[in-house]
Interface confidence: low
């Protein structure tokens, strides 16, 4: 008799794929000729692109009125006219819904100012946030984000209260909190009193780009948070290129998409957008490179392989890799909600298995180092339910040159510098 199938866990929409942050709508829209529409309307025109990325939610803004450091001139219920109107926003919500893309609104109050939370007027601000949650929930948003919560006094209790409002409206609504902290204890104390909170932090940004260190960070985090759902990113707002050299971008994409939890990216992460390439552009919000005309001030500064258009036409590009990983992440049960087991594969490497019941299983092997390495996969580290076969099929490599679909002998696995492999193998009873 076949073994009984394991009961599927209840999955919310944010469990099913990546979130995509658009912190600066004007930068996302691009400054190229013809971009005269209000940025919110411009974003509506980019929903097909976002659908092609298979992202499940957009984290938008902040877009509310905020006069720098002036609490009286900060209105969380009003959209800053620089971004568009309430009508533009309603229209965006409707269009996004039709494409099954959820919209999360960032309500970080003083986003233009020194202290995001007007430290001296916390109670006034907290009341404004409460009112805004109710207002925007009624308007149809799917969730909220608040950032820099390390600057919010009594953050845990405020977050619990805001979580109650959000979940009270519907269990299908999400609250994301962001912190600049990379300290595990601080992160755990924020999570302690907020069971369903999704927290983005700088925890992984300190990975030191070595396989062992990254493995230890990930496993420590998962052990400490138990079986609660988590998110994976390198920071609460910034681009991957702020933290990573170009040669590690593919590796991190593969890792973020295959760890157990919700991957969270910033606009431009899918193409390796880097502010350093665009003189005069702010590090935290460089212009999105849709094509070579997106940065018109400097003829020749932007080459095709830096843009969405150029990378869309190249099956070996970072964007193509992002799309493939996002697709796998959103449809494979083992990646959607499978168990996770990290195991030893040798110095410099980080490897783990994702598996769910009798579904196809996935093996991830990541080489963070600058030298090629042979993987010594230590299957003895794994529980019986997650044993390794002798061979696994190559689903994809972050480096060109390997034949996809070909079976690889796991005992003889060699990885190029900065190479990540995603391998698949069937369940064996």
């Amino acid at each position: 008799r076949a073994p009984r199938c394991r009961e599927l866990p209840a999955q919310k929409w944010w469990h099913t794929g990546a979130l995509y942050r658009i912190g600066d709508l004007q930068a996302f829209q691009g400054h190229g000729a013809g971009n005269l529409a209000a940025p919110i309307s411009g974003l509506k025109g980019r929903l097909d692109y976002l659908s092609s990325l298979k992202v499940k939610g957009l984290v938008l803004g902040p877009i509310h009125k905020n006069q720098k450091d002036d609490v009286a001139q900060t209105d969380l219920l009003q959209i800053d006219p620089n971004f568009g109107s309430k009508e533009d926003f309603d229209s965006l919500l409707q269009s996004a819904k039709k494409k099954s893309i959820r919209v999360i609104l960032d309500l970080t109050p003083n986003y233009r100012g020194e202290n995001s939370w007007f430290s001296t007027q916390v109670d006034t601000v907290a009341t404004k946030v409460k009112d805004a949650l109710e207002f925007w929930l009624q308007a149809g948003v799917d969730g909220f984000q608040v950032r820099d919560i390390e600057n919010l006094k009594d953050a845990s209790s405020f977050l619990a209260e805001w979580q109650n409002i959000t979940k009270g409206f519907s269990e299908d609504r999400l609250l994301i909190a962001g912190t600049n902290s990379s300290d595990l204890q601080q992160i755990l104390s924020l999570l302690e009193s907020n069971k369903d909170l999704l927290l983005t932090s700088s925890y992984l940004s300190d990975s030191g780009s070595t396989g062992e260190h990254t493995k230890s960070l990930v496993t420590q985090y998962l052990n400490a948070t138990g079986n609660r759902w988590c998110s994976w990113s390198l920071s609460q707002a910034r681009l991957l290129t702020s933290f990573l050299p170009a040669q590690l971008l593919r590796l991190y994409q593969l890792m973020l998409f295959t760890l157990p939890g919700t991957p969270v990216f910033s606009y431009g992460d899918e193409i390796g957008l880097d502010a350093a390439a665009l003189p005069g552009q702010p590090m935290e919000a460089p212009v999105m490179l849709w094509d070579e005309s997106s940065f018109p001030d400097i003829p020749g500064a932007v080459s095709a392989n830096m843009t969405v258009k150029g990378q869309s036409e190249d099956p070996g590009s970072l964007l193509s890799l992002f799309r493939r990983l996002s697709d796998q992440r959103s449809k494979e049960r083992s990646l959607l909600h499978g168990d996770f087991h990290a195991f030893s594969a040798g110095p410099g490497l980080f490897s783990y298995i994702r598996h769910w019941d009798q579904n196809e299983r996935f093996l991830v092997v990541l080489n963070f180092g600058d030298v090629g390495l042979s993987a010594g996969l230590q299957a003895s580290d794994l529980p019986a339910s997650a044993s390794l076969p002798a061979k696994a099929d190559l689903l994809l490599s972050t480096q060109p040159g390997r034949e996809e679909g070909s079976p690889l002998e796991l005992e003889r696995l060699k990885l190029e510098p900065h190479e990540g492999l995603l391998l698949r193998f069937p369940y064996a009873a």
């Epitope: 040669q247 003189p279 005069g280 940065f295 001030d297 400097i298 830096m306």
Partner: antibody, heavy 125, light 108 residues
Amino acid sequence: QVQLVQSGAEVKKPGASVKVSCKASGYTFTGYYMHWLRQAPGQGLEWMGWINPNTGDTNYIQKFQGRVTMTRDTSISTAYMELSRLRSDDTAVFYCARIRVYYESGIYNYPLHHWGQGTLVTVSS
Amino acid sequence: EIVLTQSPGTLSLSPGERATLSCRASQSVSSSYLAWYQQKPGQAPRLLIYGASSRATGIPDRFSGSGSGTDFTLTISRLEPEDFAVYYCQQYGSSPWTFGQGTKVEIK
């Protein structure tokens, strides 16, 4: 091709001001920061700061704060650097310079690639 | 600010010889943001190397750069007559951008 052409040599008395110009051609002037540097006779190079010709935003190093003013006139693609309250130790060649974006193997870089020919400012009583 | 110290101050060599110039930083510099410039009397500096080891457009391959962290080197494999000049290293990874005091390569 990119060219930065600076104004001619100047002789100034201590306490006076000098304004050096840098006319850009061969690229969109508003697209790149303009950097200013100086070099005293027989000495090394010293970076003074930059102006963003697009917005007029400036960034000066501490040493020159209060004495230097960088401006631009986008209609004639020209940047200016004015140094006031001149002293004899301000005698130097002043350069304007512009970065170039290099992109290869997925890595970006932006060193100072294009330089003006330099303007000698002599401060002497 | 990051202080860059170049050594030696002067290097006396003959054409055809190999020149090795050193640049040491007071704190770690991202190797992506270290450049070398050549300057001849009465001329503006000319970019030779950026990103510690990449040659700028039009620079002959006898010039090469290496190093990371706090120690960087410019090597001229075989000195040509036109290579006798002053060489500066510069970091542009953190503000303020700073230069070394220069190394003069003179004919022996």
